[in-house]
C-alpha cells in the first residue's frame, strides 16, 4: 500500500525518466548555484513537500539528493539563516518502512543523522546545522538540483 506522497514521488520520477533524454548540462543555468558537480536552486517561498517535488520537476530537475555527509556539509554551508528549513528528496516509505530517496534508493543509515520520527507522512528537511523529519504537509522552502555532466575527453580511433 503506497501513501499519496509515495505515489506522487513515483509518478513524478517516472515522468522525469521519460523526458530526461536531453543534452548533458555543462554549466549551471541562470539563477542556479554551482556546488561541485551539481547546480542548486534555493527557493525563497514555501511549499509542502509534494508541491516542492513537483516544482523541481517542472524545472527539469529533482529535489536535492545528498550522497554523503560531506555533500550535506557543503550544502548546509550555502544556507545563511539557522532557522530556515529546506525540503530535500527524501521521505518515509510506509510500504518499506524505511527512508527512501526519490530516485528509489534507500538511505544509508550512516549518511544523515535525522532528528525526529520515521513514520508515515514524514519527509526530510535540512537546516544550516541539522537534518529533520517533518510532516510532509509542512510548508517550508526547498532545494532543487540538476546534475552537471562531467566533461570527458573524447578518444577518437586512428583514422
Amino acid at each position: 500500500q503506497k501513501s499519496s506522497i509515495e505515489k506522487c514521488s513515483v509518478d513524478i520520477q517516472q515522468s522525469r525518466n521519460k523526458t530526461t533524454e536531453r543534452p548533458g548540462l555543462l554549466n549551471c543555468p541562470i539563477y542556479w548555484q554551482q556546488l561541485r558537480e551539481k547546480c542548486l536552486l534555493f527557493s525563497h517561498t514555501v511549499n509542502p513537500w509534494n508541491n516542492s517535488l513537483a516544482d523541481c520537476s517542472t524545472k527539469e530537475s529533482s529535489l536535492l539528493l545528498i550522497r554523503d555527509k560531506d555533500e550535506l556539509i557543503h550544502t548546509q554551508n550555502l544556507i545563511r539563516d539557522k532557522a530556515i528549513l529546506f525540503w530535500i528528496g527524501l521521505n518515509f516509505s510506509l510500504s518499506e518502512k524505511n527512508w527512501k530517496w526519490i530516485n528509489g534508493s534507500f538511505l544509508n543509515s550512516n549518511d544523515l543523522e535525522i532528528r525526529g520520527d520515521a513514520k508515515e507522512n514524514s519527509c526530510i528537511s535540512i537546516s544550516q546545522t541539522s537534518v529533520y523529519s517533518e510532516y510532509c504537509s509542512t510548508e517550508i522552502r526547498w532545494i532543487c538540483q540538476k546534475e552537471l555532466t562531467p566533461v570527458r575527453n573524447k578518444v577518437y580511433p586512428d583514422s
Partner: antibody, heavy 121, light 108 residues
Amino acid sequence: QVQLQESGPGLVKPSETLSLTCTVSGGSIDYFYWTWIRQSPGKGLEWIGYIYHSGSTNYNPSLKSRVTMSLDTSKNQFSLKLTSVTTADTAVYYCARDGGIVGATNALDIWGQGTMVTVSS
Amino acid sequence: EIVLTQSPGTLSLSPGERATLSCRASQSVSSSYLAWYQQKPGQAPRLLIYGASSRATGIPDRFSGSGSGTDFTLTISRLEPEDFAVYYCQQYGSSPLTFGGGTKVEIK
C-alpha cells in the same frame, strides 16, 4: 514591504569608475538575486547583472570586463562598479530585486526609483 | 543572446478599448520565463506579468499575458486612463536577461 534606494554620484568623468550602492530596507537580502539595470535617455532597458546572497554573480557579457558587483549583508546593501566609463554609459541606473525562477513571484518584482548618472568631462 | 522584438512600436487607442501587444523572441524562451513591465515617464518599470501569464501582486485583472516558445502577448482588456504608458517584455530563462524595445500605448 521591501524597498530599494540607489545612491551615488550623478556625474562621472570619462575613463573613471562609476560606483553606485543600493540599500534594501524592509526585508532580507537572502535567496534573492540583486540586480542592476540601466536605461539610456530615450532608449530601452539593459540588464547589467546580478549578485546572489552567497556572493556569486552573473554579468551581461557585453559589460563583463568592466563590471564588479559586491554585497554587504550586514548593511543590507549591494553595489555596482563600472570601470573605464564613456559617454555611452550615461543612463538612469536602477537596482532591483529578482525573484529568479522559483517562488510566488519570478522576475524583477521590486525596483528602486533609479538614479541618473551622466558621464562628462 | 535572445533578442526580443516588440510590436507595434506605438499603439494609439482610446480609453475603454482593448490593447494587444506582441513580443517575439529570436529563439524559444525557456519554460515561458517571460515578464511584462509597465513604465511611466520619470518612473521605474513595474512588473505586471511573470511566467508569461501570471499576474504580479496587485495588478488588475484587465491585464493578461499569454503565449509560449517564441510568441507572447500582453492584453489590456479595457484601457483605463492610467494604462497609457510604455510596456516592455523581458525574458529571464537564459543569460543574459534581455528586454524588448518597448511598445508605447498612447491616447488616440
